[in-house]
Amino acid sequence: IWELKKDVYVVELDWYPDAPGEMVVLTCDTPEEDGITWTLDQSSEVLGSGKTLTIQVKEFGDAGQYTCHKGGEVLSHSLLLLHKKEDGIWSTDILKDQKEPKNKTFLRCEAKNYSGRFTCWWLTTISTDLTFSVKSSRGSSDPQGVTCGAATLSAERVRGDNKEYEYSVECQEDSACPAAEESLPIEVMVDAVHKLKYENYTSSFFIRDIIKPDPPKNLQLKPLKNSRQVEVSWEYPDTWSTPHSYFSLTFCVQVQGKSKREKKDRVFTDKTSATVICRKNASISVRAQDRYYSSSWSEWASVPCS
Amino acid sequence: RNLPVATPDPGMFPCLHHSQNLLRAVSNMLQKARQTLEFYPCTSEEIDHEDITKDKTSTVEACLPLELTKNESCLNSRETSFITNGSCLASRKTSFMMALCLSSIYEDLKMYQVEFKTMNAKLLMDPKRQIFLDQNMLAVIDELMQALNFNSETVPQKSSLEEPDFYKTKIKLCILLHAFRIRAVTIDRVMSYLNAS
């Protein structure tokens, strides 16, 4: 058993039918010695008396808020949560496996640049009685500071019969140098509590591997005289690291017909312009990627050909 | 990434082309190592990230773009003295810092070259003959060093009398390639920045 926060305790249970569970001793936080009784949750049934209460925690019915009283007055509370270990592996009931980029991906993180700021998000089908707390650091043995905000509900989607909820959090490395070569990964730890169930999820990454630039901005077309060709131009996104001559991007320019079946023409360039043939009813899209370290491509920025 | 390869303009900063080739070569070699050594811990998540140049060179600090020198987190002042002549500086009025930067890059390349050559000698003794260093990568390191043209003491190739542990050597190769790829990215950024200025 360990303390998650003041008066909230996590009991780790080897979870299988007929498991013996864990013996837990609760102590009433009071100078009083006599006349103390214990109850669980809203029940008035007295579970025991005395300054300490010994319980055998086996199932969720044994978890909850234990309260010690004296003469009708509440003295202290202890909330017991359960953390299930199923055949050596901690349960992952609360969050959905996003399966991207690989199976068992519960937390996904992205950074728009090398400033040390990143966003993580996760999915759940649970709508109520759910709380998250996020901590992060650079490295684990001698951790360096990363500050994370509060996790917030960022999107709701309907998936088949189920509603899916997306939560996200923003974090910032306390002293980040955009040009630094990372040797220790960022560690992100999310504590999830649903009713009386506790779970924790972790992700470990280098900022360089989670870079996804914003789409190029100010995408414009300039028709070339007496030609079906157009000059496409764009600019680096505002959120990208500077100077751009050091943090360079490479670009992919795509001409896409109205029908998805039509052949796509693609050009790769390090410049911020390109000359392409603009077909009728087609659209031109441009996306960006770090020129030197192949992490994710940005989303497309698009303009119609007409 | 199978992207068209840009050919440098004739008047281009001489080292940019070489640094682009270097990054391409080390990335290809790392990809080959990951595939060939699939049953070894060779992915970024599995290896220890070690930098053999740590405390010996200070490329990131010495080559910091001017715009980032205001960022206190980037100023880890590690003082190292370097030789300050080099042909990449040709026909450019260059600050002392730029000379330090390029000589630091040269020292990095020299250290990695020695490590890779020592490692290749061991890998050639492996009866499995599973993996060797790409000669193209070694050649590209050499070309960039020549383009930098710094006079520096030659570092003798390390020789080891004991029987090599091939498993450890292959893991070390992965560690070295990951670190060298990261350094090659920094070198490419620096060359691109110097070329633009």
């Epitope: 080897d14 979870w15 299988y16 039918p17 007929d18 498991a19 199932e59 969720f60 270990k85 199923e86 055949d87 050596g88 592996i89 009931d93 690989k102 199976n103 068992k104 089908t125 | 049953f39 811990p41 599995e46």
Partner: antibody
């Protein structure tokens, strides 16, 4: 105390369907994940499918994906395996098993797919 | 086909010590715990070892398990006639959990 009893096995022609049941008793069935495991005659053990305690997630072996469906009725303390488009290679003893470090197995039910 | 490899058979005289190996990879045994089962002819598998080296109550201390890196092994000391059975190791893969990975199985013969 914990008891699992499989039923529903038998002889069936290729391409036909069969539904196996596993009746659980002696524990809080709705709190635990459950597996189906099979064993072809003279062969080793092969995992077939898993279902979470609340039925929210189901996982299948590639060999049965798209043909078999695992489900549970927690109000009846029963686990099911719906087997469609049966093949000769599905012939095996089918066991249900609890998920956990100390697991409990049923006695198995024989499924024979033969024309 | 199983990704955990066991020898097809091992044998020993009564009173002898036999060991069964179970070889996997970094993503399965290297990252997860191992169980061992005994299966007597015509019966369901019986758990012998869990969490690599732990014995459930009722299993004789002649059976012991160990794990090192990407391999595990089961040792039976003081071999007895009733130990003649099939033995299976079981683990998980970190990417396909909760799918059970079983070993190929080993037939133990008491000479």
């Amino acid at each position: 105390q914990v008891q699992l009893v499989e039923s529903g096995g038998g002889v069936v022609q290729p391409g036909r369907s069969l539904r196996l049941s596993c009746a659980a008793s002696g524990f809080t069935f709705s709190s635990y994940g459950m597996h189906w495991v099979r064993q072809a005659p003279g062969k080793g053990l092969e995992w077939v499918a898993f279902i979470r305690y609340d039925g929210s997630n189901k996982y299948y072996a590639d060999s049965v994906k798209g043909r078999f469906t695992i489900s549970r009725d927690n109000s009846k303390n029963t686990l099911y395996l719906q087997m469609n488009s049966l093949r000769a290679e599905d012939t095996a003893v089918y066991y249900c098993k609890t998920h956990g470090s100390h697991d409990n197995w049923g006695q198995g039910t024989m499924v024979t797919v033969s024309s | 086909q199983s990704v955990l490899t066991q020898p097809p058979s091992v044998s020993g005289a009564p009173g002898q010590r036999v060991t069964i190996s179970c070889s996997g990879s970094r993503s399965n045994i290297g990252s997860n715990t191992v169980k061992w089962y005994q299966q007597l002819p015509g019966t369901a598998p019986k758990l012998l070892i869990y969490y690599n080296d732990q014995r459930p109550s009722g299993v004789p201390d002649r059976f012991s398990g160990s794990k090192s890196g990407t391999s595990a092994s089961l040792a039976i000391t003081g071999l007895q006639a009733e130990d003649e059975a099939d033995y299976y190791c079981q683990s998980y893969d970190r990417y396909t959990h909760p799918a059970l990975l079983f070993g190929t199985g080993t037939k133990v013969t008491v000479l």
